[in-house]
Structure formats: structure tokens, C-alpha cells
Interface confidence: low
């Protein structure tokens, strides 16, 4: 038997992936554990092996199908269980009835690119990845720009309260190296959270023209 507090948290990427993290205070030694997903109204089920991510937490991704296939809807409920092997048996360590569209975390935005750059401004675009068509335009974004001598945590957040897959950064310093990141969140879902930040996009503003005020 395993003592200690257990936390089992999962998010749906809105298409064909459920990512789960299981934390257990009373750490398990050399025990094989899995997450099992059983939808209430579908004929498939899926499992993934929990792999350690720290001393007392494990994670895995339930791959439900092709990345852009719509495997679950707003009416689905998926019974998720953590099962750990105890000798020849499997023991249920945690269980939840998971409502996928109440627990959303989308994939990080991709394909970031500089559309146009000047001395003081830069226009950047991106794409969302594996996001359900159910959202239509009901998405919001946060963006941040890393300036020289600062950290990401210090970067002010820019909020885009609509599905706008571009931004025009202004009041930049000429001939300066910057990095840019963006993340996305659906408006739907009581426990929905922000996607991971995108991979940083590095860009450099143009130098100021010689002999002109900047």
C-alpha cells in the first residue's frame, strides 16, 4: 500500500492528446504505473506509461489518435485512472471522471515568424497547433518580449483578448536583439489553463539610419 497525499492532474489539448501528471508524497520505488483512459461513450480506450519527472511525480501523454483528429467532444466524460503494479496485481492509485473541455491546455503556438521589422517596431505572426474547430474564434493569447539584460519573468505580458495570430511590437530600440514568445488559451473550461510558451523567436531591429534622429 502507498501512503501520503496523491494529486492527479490531466489536461486535454482539444484534439487527440490528454497529458497527465501524478504526484505521490510517499514515493514509489521501482513500481510500474500507467494511466488508463476509458471514455463513457466511445469504443476505444488508451493507456500510457507514467515516467518519472521528479522525485515524487510522474507524467505521460495519452495519444488518442492522429494529431488533428477530434477524438472527444464537449459531452464526453473520460474515466482516468492511475494503476500501479503490486506483485501480479494492478492497484488503482487515483481515479477521476475527466471532462475534457473543462480541462483544456492547448499545444504551444508554432511557426513564429517575423513578418516585417523596422528600427522601432516588429510585426510577428504565429499559428495555433492542434486546436479544435469547436473554439471558432473563442481564444485569447498572451505574448512577451525579452529585452537585453532582462529575464523572461521580468517581461511584461501583452494580452490579446481575441483570436489574433499576429502582433505589432512597438517602442523597440534600434539595432537590438530581442526574443519573443506567445501562448494561447481557450475561453471555455472551468479548469482550463494557458498553453506552454512557444519556442522563442529571436529577431533584431534595424539600425537607425546614420545622421537622423531616432
Amino acid at each position: 500500500a502507498v501512503n501520503g497525499t496523491s494529486q492527479f492532474t490531466c489536461f486535454y489539448n482539444s484534439r487527440a492528446n490528454i497529458s497527465c501528471v501524478w504526484s505521490q508524497d510517499g514515493a514509489l520505488q521501482d513500481t510500474s504505473c500507467q494511466v488508463h483512459a476509458w471514455p463513457d461513450r466511445r469504443r476505444w480506450n488508451q493507456t500510457c506509461e507514467l515516467l518519472p519527472v521528479s522525485q515524487a511525480s510522474w507524467a505521460c501523454n495519452l495519444i488518442l489518435g492522429a494529431p488533428d483528429s477530434q477524438k472527444l467532444t464537449t459531452v464526453d466524460i473520460v474515466t482516468l485512472r492511475v494503476l500501479c503494479r503490486e506483485g501480479v496485481r494492478w492497484r488503482v492509485m487515483a481515479i477521476q471522471d475527466f471532462k475534457p473541455f473543462e480541462n483544456l491546455r492547448l499545444m504551444a503556438p508554432i511557426s513564429l515568424q517575423v513578418v516585417h521589422v523596422e528600427t522601432h517596431r516588429c510585426n510577428i505572426s504565429w499559428e495555433i497547433s492542434q486546436a479544435s474547430h469547436y473554439f471558432e474564434r473563442h481564444l485569447e493569447f498572451e505574448a512577451r518580449t525579452l529585452s537585453p539584460g532582462h529575464t523572461w519573468e521580468e517581461a511584461p505580458l501583452l494580452t490579446l483578448k481575441q483570436k489574433q495570430e499576429w502582433i505589432c511590437l512597438e517602442t523597440l530600440t534600434p539595432d537590438t536583439q530581442y526574443e519573443f514568445q506567445v501562448r494561447v488559451k481557450p475561453l471555455q473550461g472551468e479548469f482550463t489553463t494557458w498553453s506552454p510558451w512557444s519556442q522563442p523567436l529571436a529577431f533584431r531591429t534595424k539600425p537607425a539610419a546614420l545622421g537622423k534622429d531616432t
Epitope: 488508463h36 480506450n45 494492478w90 471522471d97
Partner: nanobody, 123 residues
Framework: EVQLVESGGGLVQAGGSLRLACALS????????MAWFRQAPGKEREFVAS????????DYVASVQGRFTVSRDNNKNTVYLQMNSLKPEDTAVYYC????????????????WGQGTQVTVSS
């Protein structure tokens, strides 16, 4: 290899109660929808009750509805059949069945079966 072992059968008077248990070994219990069937002498095996993997959904044959309750304990790899208000016509060998497909659980030829436990209800 999946194995099912039933227990809890016996002789009981009409109006009495029995609780059958069925333990699954050899695979992950929560993969399976579980069911109870019965076969009276000279009759075909018939579906009695089933419970889905999560325990969320149960199903009963009309003749036992309200008298029998099927349940499962996923920590103990065991499914139960609580039988109350037993009648002489409930006399049969009771079989436990397992199937990974909920929609096939009533199918006699696609289930994994236990060896059965005798229930006799005397009047």
C-alpha cells in the same frame, strides 16, 4: 492469461440473501466490463447483470431488477453480485464473465468465463 474465480454460492431459503464475488487475475481489472450470467438445469445460460469498468453503469435482466445489485471494487480486482429476496427460480449455476468491450458483454462466445458457483434457493 486472465482467470476468474467465483465464490459465495450456497443453499439459502426463499426470501434470503447471498453475495457472490468474482476475482480477476492475470490482467488489469479496470480494462474489463464485468457481468454475471446463470444457467439453470436444462436451460441456456442467461445474462443477469453487468457493470462497466468504472462502475458508473450497471445493467440488469428484468427478472432480477430491484432484487440484485452488481458492483465492483477496482482496488480488490473483484466484482460482486448482492442477491436479495431470492426465489426458487433463481436456482442456477452463476458464472462470472469479463470482456474488454462493453458492447460485447452479453455475447456468450466472446467473454472470458469463471468456473461457476452453485446457488440453490429452497422453498
Amino acid at each position: 492469461e486472465v482467470q476468474l474465480v467465483e465464490s459465495g454460492g450456497g443453499l439459502v431459503q426463499a426470501g434470503g440473501s447471498l453475495r457472490l464475488a468474482c476475482a480477476l487475475s492475470g490482467d488489469v481489472f479496470v480494462r474489463y466490463t464485468m457481468a454475471w450470467f446463470r444457467q439453470a438445469p436444462g436451460k441456456e445460460r442467461e445474462f443477469v447483470a453487468s457493470v462497466t469498468d468504472s462502475g458508473r453503469t450497471t445493467d440488469y435482466v428484468a427478472s432480477v431488477q430491484g432484487r440484485f445489485t452488481v458492483s465492483r471494487d477496482n482496488n480488490k480486482n473483484t466484482v460482486y453480485l448482492q442477491m436479495n429476496s431470492l426465489k426458487p427460480e433463481d436456482t442456477a449455476v452463476y458464472y462470472c464473465a469479463a470482456n474488454t468491450d462493453y458492447f460485447q458483454i452479453r455475447s456468450l462466445d466472446r467473454n472470458t468465463w469463471g468456473q461457476g458457483t452453485q446457488v440453490t434457493v429452497s422453498s
